[in-house]
Amino acid sequence: MRTEAQVPALQPPEPGLEGAMGHRTLVLPWVLLTLCVTAGTPEVWVQVRMEATELSSFTIRCGFLGSGSISLVTVSWGGPNGAGGTTLAVLHPERGIRQWAPARQARWETQSSISLILEGSGASSPCANTTFCCKFASFPEGSWEACGSLPPSSDPGLSAPPTPAPILRADLAGILGVSGVLLFGCVYLLHLLRRHKHRPAPRLQPSRTSPQAPRARAWAPSQASQAALHVPYATINTSCRPATLDTAHPHGGPSWWASLPTHAAHRPQGPAAWASTPIPARGSFVSVENGLYAQAGERPPHTGPGLTLFPDPRGPRAMEGPLGVR
């Protein structure tokens, strides 16, 4: 996702310092500062819909909100892929699609979103409380996964009780990759500024540029190291009804399409009903940032109950190995 922050104006260092440190030494901190401020946290959203006409038929939609390029999407059910989940489809942005029953049709909708239609008949058909997960492998962010499920009720006339649904996960691969370099740079930058200015480094305050804008946060060194060690797992409660949308979406916007960032906001060619179905007003959203707030001792301002944090047991090499069906 793209983050925006209003950065306080920083005064250039005293001329004496410039002579002591050298011009080239000064360039690095400002480059790093720019990277620290602009580096955003990608997010994954998942929508699970039960067809009103065919109650045992599901449509899953997933999207990636990040600036990196997607290298692979894996859709699984019964839990996260590699953690007891069974792969339903693997989608490569250039090389195509592999899918398995009960997947009827997997397809790319936009450059950053996919859809999967599941068949409703047969022994392998999904049950109402099945968890569906979408995992996006991207460069340079790494691997990000979100999950959502439908409640036990299959009666289109009844609204089901809330069920624990979407999960969002970032594998350590991304955080320990490019992000690790940035974090190290940020720590180094703060160290330099403290050392040479003889005063605390300017603290970047989170700010909301608009009601819809995501919250940006500048990490202090302690938070940065924690963020690299603890992969956030955020869980929220949602309720689900047939023929409505369930979302694990980072924005509680007025409509699904309107809330996508610019690079993914063009509508895919799909049923008009999707484009016009509003997200419920309660439309909670899940963000990896939740974990950072929790680690900093603050309650995330936008999560529902039951926030849990724990690292991916598979570690930083989780996405290695052949793409596809292993």
């Epitope: 090389r95 592999r98 292993r326």
Partner: antibody, heavy 119, light 107 residues
């Protein structure tokens, strides 16, 4: 050497069923999907479906969904395709092929099994 | 289903010549197209994957190109052993579909 060895030719009667085998060797069977392809006499190729030997997950071409059933036996590294309710239209050469999930293509093909449906 | 059209059913060429076999997809399939060679009485063999990548052991006389909906297999310095049927395949979306094939004849 990576190899896929298929069972021999079959001459069957209309309405009956036939089960073709495809034995894999030279690699870890569960690491690659097995797909099946039909080639009618003098015609092009048609993709029937795929199976993941890891968990038995399948994907069928809708055209063959009521015709073919794909299974695997991990213990013998063998994939099977059963064809049912056979008609003369099913007379063809059937190939099993290995799907390379690194590079996304069919990198190894078996020699094929000829099925002839005749009364 | 995506239709893969190989408009030339037969192509005739001479040893040493250069020949281009084309394949057109009914919709955008990015680079999810492979080429397979089937010699008489044999099973198909992989030539090119993902539009332009040569399968292991395939001579560099064979090159693939294209993306979107138009794809080409080019054989330069044609040899007598290249007499075969050539099929394109799309795996962009299920069901995967093959082209009708192009039979290369050597004069």
């Amino acid at each position: 050497e990576v190899q896929l060895q298929q069972s021999g030719p079959e001459l069957v009667k209309p309405g009956s069923s036939v089960k073709i085998s495809c034995k894999a060797s030279g690699y870890t069977f569960t690491d690659y999907n097995i797909d099946w392809v039909k080639q009618s006499h003098g015609k092009s190729l048609e993709w029937i479906g795929a199976i993941d030997p890891n968990n038995g997950g399948t994907n069928y071409n809708q055209k063959f969904k009521d015709k073919a059933t794909l299974t695997v036996d991990k213990s013998s590294s063998t994939a099977y395709m059963e064809l049912r309710s056979l008609t003369s239209e099913d007379s063809a050469v059937y190939y099993c092929t290995r799907w390379d999930s690194n590079d996304w293509y069919f990198d190894v093909w078996a020699t094929g099994t000829t099925v002839t449906v005749s009364s | 289903d995506i239709v893969m059209t190989q408009s030339q059913k037969f192509m005739s060429t001479s040893v040493g010549d250069r020949v281009s076999i084309t394949c057109k997809a009914s919709q955008n399939v990015r680079i999810a197209v492979d080429w397979y060679q089937q010699k008489p009485g044999q099973s198909p063999k992989a030539l090119i994957f993902s539009s332009s990548n040569r399968h292991t052991g395939v001579p560099d006389r064979f090159t693939g190109s294209g993306s979107g909906s138009d794809f080409t297999l080019t054989i330069r310095n044609v040899q007598s052993e290249d007499l075969a049927d050539y099929f394109c395949l799309q795996h962009w979306i299920s069901p995967y579909t093959f082209g009708g094939g192009t039979k290369l004849e050597i004069r």
